[in-house]
């Protein structure tokens, strides 16, 4: 059994989240994950889900009684989702930590927007980029 | 030329964000995107980047002078990143809008954690999970 299972059960008790009534009014994540079979689509959704859990865990980082459980789960997420790749995890964390209200961050984001957009569609990497993108001058 | 280019230039002017070169170590997103070539890795990162822009645009939704630019860019993001798939976009938006401080959301998230974790690694869908992952102890 993966280590996260026991620790997640521990968290369920802590949050009083074991009862079936918690599942009332639909799911948060599971229903959405069911909709997407294609790996890249799943990554789009899972990226948001993982960042949600990281934020949630951060809110409870000072709570001694669940610290070990949280750390174990985060570590297992690191193995499963980031394939134990520290650089991948660090880049992800960096992205999740940018403050949308920071004026410098806003201006940088706007500055980079055109280049970010040019890379958004899968075709952008394969050399099949539209001529208009190749001609763009920032 | 893609419609977003002109509108992004308009936003640059509005933010007075200039045309100076952005050094690699000074970028928010471009340096990170450069690190990842694998499509699923890119989607993990781009998912965070796109949600950042959506949040940023939400902050400026009442600003008449850039409304058209913002709407055009969002629409182009929809085409490029979500492949014009409304369901994909809606599921994504749903995930980004969950409040991490809402107690009911917290309980649901913890309730679903075990199943979410089980689906995180690509192999989880194919039944070919690595033995090392099965043995991993956090």
């Amino acid at each position: 059994q993966d280590p996260y299972v026991k620790e997640a059960e521990n968290l369920k008790k802590y949050f009083n989240a074991g009862h079936s009534d918690v599942a009332d009014n639909g799911t948060l994540f599971l229903g959405i994950l069911k909709n997407w079979k294609e790996e890249s689509d799943r990554k789009i959704m899972q990226s948001q889900i993982v960042s949600f859990y990281f934020k949630l865990f951060k809110n409870f980082k000072d709570d001694q009684s669940i610290q070990k459980s949280v750390e174990t789960i985060k570590e297992d997420m690191n193995v499963k989702f980031f394939n134990s790749n520290k650089k991948k995890r660090d880049d992800f964390e960096k992205l999740t930590n940018y403050s949308v209200t920071d004026l410098n961050v806003q201006r940088k984001a706007i500055h980079e927007l055109i280049q970010v957009m040019a890379e958004l569609s899968p075709a952008a990497k394969t050399g099949k980029r539209k001529r208009s993108q190749m001609l763009f001058r920032g | 030329q893609d419609p977003y280019v002109k509108e992004a230039e308009n936003l640059k002017k509005y933010f007075n964000a200039g045309h100076s070169d952005v050094a690699d170590n000074g970028t928010l997103f471009l340096g990170i995107l450069k690190n990842w070539k694998e499509e699923s890795d890119r989607k993990i990162m781009q998912s965070q980047i796109v949600s950042f822009y959506f949040k940023l645009f939400k902050n400026f939704k009442d600003d008449q002078s850039i409304q058209k630019s913002v709407e055009t860019i969002k629409e182009d993001m929809n085409v490029k990143f979500f492949n014009s798939n409304k369901k994909k976009r809606d599921d994504f938006e749903k995930l980004t809008n969950y409040s991490v401080t809402d107690l009911n959301v917290q309980r649901k998230a913890i309730h679903e954690l075990i199943q979410v974790m089980a689906e995180l690694s690509p192999a989880a869908k194919t039944g070919k999970r690595k033995r090392s992952q099965m043995l991993f102890r956090g």
């Epitope: 920071d102 004026l103 410098n104 961050v105 | 509005y14 964000a17 200039g18 100076s20 952005v22």
Partner: antibody, heavy 117, light 106 residues
Framework: QVQLVQSGSELKKPGASVKISCKAS????????MNWVKQAPGQGLKWMGW????????TYVDDFKGRFVFSLDTSVSAAYLQISSLKAEDTATYFC??????????WGQGTTVTVSS | DIVLTQSPATMSASPGERVTLTCSAS?????MFWYHQRPGQSPRLLIY???NLASGVPARFSGSGSGTSYSLTISRMEPEDFATYFC?????????FGQGTKLEIK
């Protein structure tokens, strides 16, 4: 190369007005905002606000609302700071500084305003 | 308003010496900027985005920090480095500067 050239020193009486100019060259004026910074004698730097050179919209710090006005003449790539009803405490050196992509990356040489009766 | 507190207010050092100046912010910020100003001159940008060297600034200058705690280090003081140093934040309105640290020759 980028240059910001400010107008010369001013000696004014209390109650008078002054208008300082900051002429930019070496870049596209409307691509970068312009900050104004005050430095009283022997003191530190105090940000007064900035003007968006594309939209013309000004942002003022609370301490500089009312008697202080930022303006532009984009045809000559110039930004202006006007101070009315001058007081002794307005005696300072005023700098314009380009709101560069990262920070206040280029500064004018400063204009000293002395308010004395 | 975010208050930036620099320490020390004045510091004496010798040429060739390693010097570290600190700047503490009253709230967390994403980036810190550093300027220096020689008497009778306008300020000059040294460091942007906490740790990046501005154009033309010698490599002996470096910046670091995060959250509320930031520092500027000069690895080997040169005669022209004796000046007043200001930290600056433009993460939220109003932009603010530290009160300055004056570096004097010992």
């Amino acid at each position: 190369q980028v240059q910001l050239v400010q107008s010369g020193s001013e000696l004014k009486k209390p109650g008078a007005s002054v208008k300082i100019s900051c002429k930019a060259s070496g870049y596209t004026f409307t691509d970068y905002g312009m900050n104004w910074v005050k430095q009283a004698p022997g003191q530190g730097l105090k940000w007064m606000g900035w003007i968006n050179t594309y939209t013309g919209e000004s942002t003022y710090v609370d301490d500089f609302k009312g008697r202080f006005v930022f303006s532009l003449d984009t045809s000559v790539s110039a930004a202006y700071l006007q101070i009315s009803s001058l007081k002794a405490e307005d005696t300072a050196t005023y700098f314009c500084a380009r709101r560069g992509f990262y920070a206040m990356d280029y500064w004018g040489q400063g204009t000293t305003v002395t308010v004395s009766s | 308003d975010i208050v930036l507190t620099q320490s020390p207010a004045t510091m004496s050092a010798s040429p060739g010496e390693r010097v570290t100046l600190t700047c503490s912010a009253s709230s967390s910020i994403s980036y810190m900027f550093w300027y220096h100003q020689r008497p009778g001159q306008s300020p000059r940008l040294l460091i942007y985005d906490t740790s990046n060297l501005a154009s033309g600034v010698p490599a002996r200058f470096s910046g670091s920090g995060s959250g509320t705690s930031y520092s500027l280090t000069i690895s080997r003081m040169e005669p022209e480095d004796f000046a007043t140093y200001f930290c600056h934040q433009s993460s939220s309105y109003p932009f603010t500067f530290g009160q300055g640290t004056k570096l004097e020759i010992k």
